[in-house]
């Protein structure tokens, strides 16, 4: 972590493992006004590499609902509506932070967890390996 | 939030605002083995809607480094390498959770924050508005 000088106005930590365990205010400050990804844009349908959004729910996690993108096709959609296998639809993945209840079912104790989620799909040129 | 029965093995919370403020263990449990997005895949270069990755750093935030995608073109790249402006490169955005130091510079006190990041780009058919 980054070493930051202790500020006299900071809350005191009595945790012996400090700074491994910290206090987190769950009143989320939202820096944007985005909504459910299904409503926020129709890119998933208009893309040449369209995707479906699957709801992943886990009450032991915060956020409990995460939307996972799955590419509809292995190829990419051309202007005439045909799927072209000379190009490939692939998921764009991102590592995100979530809070995992630990111990399980505890309402006020969490552990940070990194998970990999697919956010959408993009169309790429494949790397072709021919047999000699 | 979801009402979950209190487990006798849970840490005790003495915060008057419970469950608004919770304890979070920062020993991250990593559910995947992903690395820096620049190394983990070359989709950003092979895509028909290629993007550049910009490093966004903020020591008051955890994680302090976030990679932001910016589409290289307004149009999409064709097989011959030319950009087709009948199609549009657009950013795929995702809302992610970060921890913001609050009060500022405090090493053990955070507030959850939602931010919108661009993860990559996809090629979409534009919505054409004709003038009547």
């Amino acid at each position: 972590g980054i070493a930051i000088p202790r500020n006299s106005g900071c809350p005191n930590s009595e945790d012996k493992n400090f700074p491994r365990t910290v206090m987190v205010n769950l009143n989320i400050h939202n820096r944007n006004t985005s909504t459910n990804p299904k409503r926020s844009s129709d890119y998933y349908n208009r893309s040449t590499s369209p995707w479906n959004l699957h709801r992943n729910e886990d009450p032991e996690r915060y956020p409990s609902v995460i939307w996972e993108a799955k590419c509809r096709h292995l190829g990419c959609v051309k202007a005439d509506g045909n799927v072209d296998y000379h190009m490939n639809s692939v998921p764009i993945q991102q590592e995100i932070l979530v809070l995992r209840r630990e111990p399980r079912h505890c309402p006020n104790s969490f552990r940070l967890e990194k998970i990999l989620v697919s956010v959408g799909c993009t169309c790429v040129t494949p790397i072709v390996h021919h047999v000699a | 939030g979801i009402a979950i029965p209190r487990n006798s093995g849970c840490p005790n919370s003495e915060d008057k605002n419970f469950p608004r403020t919770v304890m979070v263990n920062l020993n991250i449990h990593n559910r995947n083995t992903s690395t820096n997005p620049k190394r983990s895949s070359d989709y950003y270069n092979r895509s028909t809607s290629p993007w550049n990755l910009h490093r966004n750093e903020d020591p008051e935030r955890y994680p302090s480094v976030i990679w932001e995608a910016k589409c290289r073109h307004l149009g999409c790249v064709k097989a011959d390498g030319n950009v087709d402006y009948h199609m549009n490169s657009v950013p795929i955005q995702q809302e992610i959770l970060v921890l913001r130091r609050e009060p500022r510079h405090c090493p053990n006190s955070f507030r959850l924050e939602k931010i919108l990041v661009s993860v990559g780009c996809t090629c979409v058919t534009p919505i054409v508005h004709h003038v009547a």
Epitope: K70, R72, H129 | -
Partner: antibody
Framework: QVQLKESGPGLVAPSQSLSITCTIS????????VHWVRQPPGKGLEWLVV???????TYNSALKSRLSITRDNSKSQVFLKMNSLQTDDTAIYYC??????????????WGQGTPVTVSS | DVVMTQTPLSLPVSLGDQASISCRSS???????????LHWYLQKPGQSPKLLIY???NRFSGVPDRFSGSGSGTDFTLKISRVEAEDLGVYFC????????FGGGTKLEIK
């Protein structure tokens, strides 16, 4: 349960066109793709065409000029039309469901097939 | 198009024996997403094909565990650990990484 059933004319004269219908049940055409595959007598399988859950299509490039695939979601039917038939188009024609929603991208359930003979 | 070559063309076996069928593709079947879309089907006499194995090594629902798939890139194998009478028929490999193609088939028959 998942079922697919092909129905066709059985006999087609050379140079004429073939129309076959696949009627499905147990799943929705807006969630799963449907393929057409044929098998000449005593030979292997030849993939023809697929119509995906979103209505997009993929054709066998060697046969594309002769093939057309459409569907009627409300009737749960997929239609194959093939033009300019010759004797070597004699085969059993199968429709098969694509495992689209499970993302295996393969044909997980098949109809029993409909035999088509091209002869004058 | 990708050419799928199966060997042998015919495989005579005794019941209870292990059987092994090979499938080779003219191009790598690894998709840009990292998955390999190689599948195996069994067509019993007078029936339509049935899916056995999807994505190289995953058994489809209801398929006995005596069937196993392996391989990578361009070389793949289907193994039947102990052949039973109901396993007789023609086995086809198929790929969907590129536009769909099938192998020529391998006939499993009693020795």
């Amino acid at each position: 349960q998942v079922q697919l059933k092909e129905s066709g004319p059985g006999l087609v004269a050379p140079s004429q066109s073939l129309s076959i219908t696949c009627t499905i049940s147990g799943f929705s055409l807006t969630s799963y793709g449907v393929h057409w595959v044929r098998q000449p007598p005593g030979k292997g399988l030849e993939w023809l065409v697929v119509i995906w859950s979103d209505g997009t299509t993929t054709y066998n490039s060697a046969l594309k000029s002769r093939l057309s695939i459409t569907r009627d979601n409300s009737k749960s039917q997929v239609f194959l039309k093939m033009n300019s038939l010759q004797t070597d188009d004699t085969a059993i024609y199968y429709c098969a469901r694509d495992s689209t929603w499970d993302y295996y991208y393969t044909m997980d359930y098949w109809g029993q097939g409909t035999p088509v003979t091209v002869s004058s | 198009d990708v050419v799928m070559t199966q060997t042998p063309l015919s495989l005579p076996v005794s019941l209870g024996d292990q059987a092994s069928i090979s499938c080779r593709s003219s191009q790598s079947l690894v998709h840009s997403n990292g998955n390999t879309y190689l599948h195996w089907y069994l067509q019993k006499p007078g029936q339509s094909p049935k899916l056995l194995i999807y994505k190289v090594s995953n058994r489809f629902s209801g398929v006995p565990d005596r069937f196993s798939g392996s391989g990578s890139g361009t070389d793949f194998t289907l193994k039947i650990s102990r052949v039973e009478a109901e396993d007789l028929g023609v086995y086809f490999c198929s790929q969907s990484t590129h536009v769909y193609t099938f192998g020529g088939g391998t006939k499993l028959e009693i020795k």
